[in-house]
């Protein structure tokens, strides 16, 4: 912590302006008043302080604001942002998007930090869900941030956010995420037609329920094989050869290359090998010719 | 990768004159603003002079008059000239782009000024 010592004569700041780049850090502690700096914040972004500096400054705001800055400091703190802990901003009451968009700026490019992630669970907590617009800020920001929320998490997201989802922002998302994600997306996109639908839907299959899968079957949607293994298993498993060959259309060569990957591998096994045979794409492994398959655990249920 | 090397510091009496050179390399140059940073021993960093991409000039209160900084995009150089040097300049002096914002830092060239 700096030292308290007196302003030297004639060094007192009348202003935040590019001069305080000089002063060292006691200089700044002594000579720079914390309710100017609070009105000027928005200088001090344009002035190449050090960080040591702007520790400073931090430190200056800290004293002013023991109980958390005001929205209209924060709005302005672009590179002190950087100076804060997820402790600092856990005191912040961020209710403007603009001010989010602000502070994120000053973040881009690198990998959100606890600050970043502390900064928007203040922001989605206090609006109450994840809305549309700050959906469509935060995944602009982070690609990968629908899929960093828990799934009690994505459940406060309203349909009508999911139209801000881009391909991309669903890579890392687990089925258990998207399993709560494409009923949202079902019902946001419902009133689209058949190829329009298909394009919007596709990213959030993972998450698709076999009823759906067979429902597209019937849509001539030719879904490419990235698609298909994204697809959960035990939605995959009850098609049958001809739903899949219809879901797949032109596609439905790839599975030759997939066989020996879920959930190709284990549908095979469920599928009769006289219906796997029509394909004409060599693929082994299905149910011999006469042999009968019992559902346990249909047995199981009625009894 | 930005590099920043700086050279020409060494021993001189007081009233003296030196001359510290800084060579860039991976970035734009002549569009950075560039700073002289020093640090005494025992003291804390304190910005020397800056110049702009434009050309402008700025200095410490403490060396006004005494130091000139310069810059040549050509060799990517920014130069400090010092002259009438006293013993309290004795530091070691690093050369930074301002956008940097990390002051004394890395290795510097050592000045040192005896009475």
């Known amino acids: 912590e700096v030292e308290k010592t007196a302003c030297p004569s004639g060094k007192k700041a009348r202003e935040i302006d590019e001069s305080l780049i000089f002063y060292k850090k006691w200089e700044l502690e002594a000579c720079v008043d914390a309710a100017l700096l609070a009105t000027q914040m928005d200088r001090v972004n344009a002035i190449p302080f050090t960080y040591e500096q702007l520790d400073v400054l931090k430190h200056k705001l800290d004293e002013l604001y023991p109980q958390g800055y005001p929205e209209s400091v924060i709005q302005h703190l672009g590179y002190l942002f950087l100076k804060m802990s997820p402790e600092d901003i856990r005191k912040w009451n961020v209710t403007s998007l603009e001010t989010l968009k602000a502070l994120l700026e000053v973040n881009k490019g690198h990998e959100m930090s606890p600050q970043v992630a502390t900064l928007i669970d203040r922001f989605v907590k206090g609006r109450g869900q994840l809305d549309k617009d700050t959906l469509d800020t935060l995944t602009a920001f982070y690609p990968g941030y629908l899929c960093s929320l828990s799934p009690e998490e994505l459940s406060s997201v309203p349909p009508s956010s999911i139209w801000a989802v881009r391909p991309q922002d669903l890579d890392t998302c687990d089925p258990r995420q998207l399993d709560v994600l494409y009923p949202k997306a079902r019902l946001a996109f419902q009133n689209m037609n058949g190829s329009e639908y298909f394009v919007k839907i596709q990213s959030f299959l993972g998450g698709a329920p076999t009823e759906d899968l067979k429902a597209l079957s019937q849509q001539n949607v030719s879904m490419d094989l990235a698609t298909f293994m994204k697809l959960r298993t035990d939605a995959v498993l009850p098609l049958t050869v001809a739903e899949v060959q219809k879901l797949l259309g032109p596609h439905v060569e790839g599975l030759k290359a997939e066989e020996r990957h879920r959930p190709v591998r284990d549908w095979i096994l469920r599928q009769r090998q006289d219906d796997l045979d029509t394909l004409g794409l060599g693929l082994q492994g299905g149910i011999p010719n006469g042999y009968l398959v019992l559902d346990l655990s249909m047995q199981e249920a009625l009894s | 990768e930005v590099q920043l090397v700086e050279s020409g510091g060494g021993s001189v009496q007081a009233g003296e004159t030196l001359q510290l050179s800084c060579t860039a390399s991976?970035?734009?140059?002549?569009?950075?603003?560039m700073g002289w940073y020093r640090q005494a021993p025992g003291d804390e960093c304190e910005l020397v002079s800056t110049?702009?991409?434009?050309?402008?000039?700025n200095y410490a209160d403490s060396v006004k008059g005494r130091f000139t900084i310069s810059q040549d995009n050509a060799k990517n150089t920014v130069y400090l000239q010092m002259t009438s040097l006293k013993p309290e300049d004795t530091a070691i002096y690093s050369c930074r782009t301002m956008a940097s914002r990390i002051g004394c830092w890395g290795q510097g060239t050592l000045v040192t000024v005896s009475s």
């Open positions: 110049i702009s991409s434009d050309g402008s000039t």
């Open positions: 991976g970035f734009t140059f002549d569009d950075s603003d």
